[in-house]
Amino acid sequence: ELCDDDPPKITHATFKAVAYKEGTMLNCECKRGFRRIKSGSPYMLCTGNSSHSSWDNQCQCTSSAARNTTKQVTPQPEEQKERKTTEMQSQMQLADQVSLPGHCREPPPWENEATERIYHFVVGQTVYYQCVQGYRALHRGPAESVCKMTHGKTRWTQPQLICTGETEPSQFPGEEEPQASPDGLPESETSRLVTTTDFRIQTEVAATMETFIFTTEYQ
């Protein structure tokens, strides 16, 4: 069952799924000047059996200018460098993590992918929130949201994270809360169902969150 709405927004925060439940769809979006190949699937789907989950279909983009060809256009060196680096970081971070049954990992980037990823989540999906760079957690309760089915309708639970740019000192002296902030998105782009594929955010959030999440929740 697909979740009707986007996960809740938190001002000055962004969210990330550590793993995607089977049934999750990821739109095959291409960046400006490129389009999905004619025979290509409009989305990738997280599917699996009892022992293994993976993304079905592969997203492929081709130049809008190129007619009747599926030739892949090589990304610019700068872009290629960033993608390779971030992909490597993701792989390194995830290598020693236990695979979560019934879930897929973040799909690797595809060439000429759009700068944002649009996911369609399913009931039972959890996403995790983090304050963006330049903001700190004034309050960090459960910084996660779960898509639940209640009375036949889906709803996301409300994360109890408040991010602030104010530098009010703690009223409990000596109690300093570590806050690893990922690179910031512009305010209009934070905390949306659309997640950025400029993987700086995702990988940094992953680096600070995944070990904690997996050790506390799944072991």
Epitope: D5, P8, K9, I10, T11, H12, L138, H139, R140, G141, P142, Q158, P159, Q160, L161, I162, T164, E166, E168, P169, S170, Q171, F172, E175, E177
Partner: antibody, heavy 115, light 107 residues
């Protein structure tokens, strides 16, 4: 079930200070920030500030900066609001409210400031 | 600070009527908006959060909509127990501010 229980009504003289409490039960107290809101007689709702029940960090509406102090005691799951240099305009019902979306409210504490 | 303006400030309606209350923010607040109902002498009660999500236990005749600067609370079929004052409030960023309230009376 979730409950926020506030301390009883107070009558104060102008210039005095006031400290009211809000005790949370039925949930993990430190999971939810606590807001304070007041309502003058016949008026609307006015946000005073928010405190992290986890870290003790607080943010105040500019109007209350320097005059209001919010604190928490996690051992008793209680949030406090202290207001100094009281004036007649502070006569109001003071509420505590839980979390990002103010999903539960205390019953209110009536404060009367009069000479 | 973000100003929240509600309209109308008061209205009178009959049982079974469809009632709409609007709330306008002075700047874009996305969907960071809540609606509360308050009865005389009682604390406010959360009805809708994040502009359109119905709070637990709230009857389905209540619904919220809108995004950006314009928001609506709708009661599809007014019941006698729906009288009271309704407030909108944003949680976009501190300071959180409330609308001035809409007093709903049953005819």
């Amino acid at each position: 079930q979730v409950q926020l229980v506030q301390s009883g009504a107070e009558v104060k003289k102008p210039g005095a200070s006031l400290k009211i409490s809000c005790k949370g039960s039925g949930y993990t107290f430190t999971d939810y920030a606590m807001h304070w809101v007041r309502q003058a007689p016949g008026q609307g709702l006015e946000w005073i500030g928010v405190i992290s029940t986890y870290s003790g960090d607080a943010i105040y509406a500019q109007k209350f900066q320097g005059r209001a102090t919010m604190t928490v005691d996690t051992s008793t799951s209680t949030a406090y609001l202290e207001l100094s240099s009281l004036r007649s305009e502070d006569t109001a019902v003071y509420y505590c409210a839980r979390g990002v979306t103010f999903d539960y409210w205390g019953q209110g504490t009536t404060v009367t400031v009069s000479s | 600070d973000i100003q929240m303006t509600q309209s109308p400030s008061s209205l009178s309606a009959s049982v079974g009527d469809r009632v709409t209350i609007t709330c306008r923010a002075s700047q874009d607040i996305s969907n960071y908006l809540e609606w509360y109902q308050q009865k005389p002498g009682k604390a406010p009660k959360l009805l809708v959060y994040n502009a359109k999500t119905l709070a637990e236990g709230v009857p389905s005749r209540f619904s919220g909509s809108g995004s950006g600067t314009d928001f609506t609370l709708t009661i599809s079929s007014l019941q006698p127990e729906d009288f009271g004052t309704y407030y909108c409030q944003h949680h976009y960023d501190t300071p959180y501010t409330f609308g001035q309230g809409t007093k709903l009376e049953i005819k």
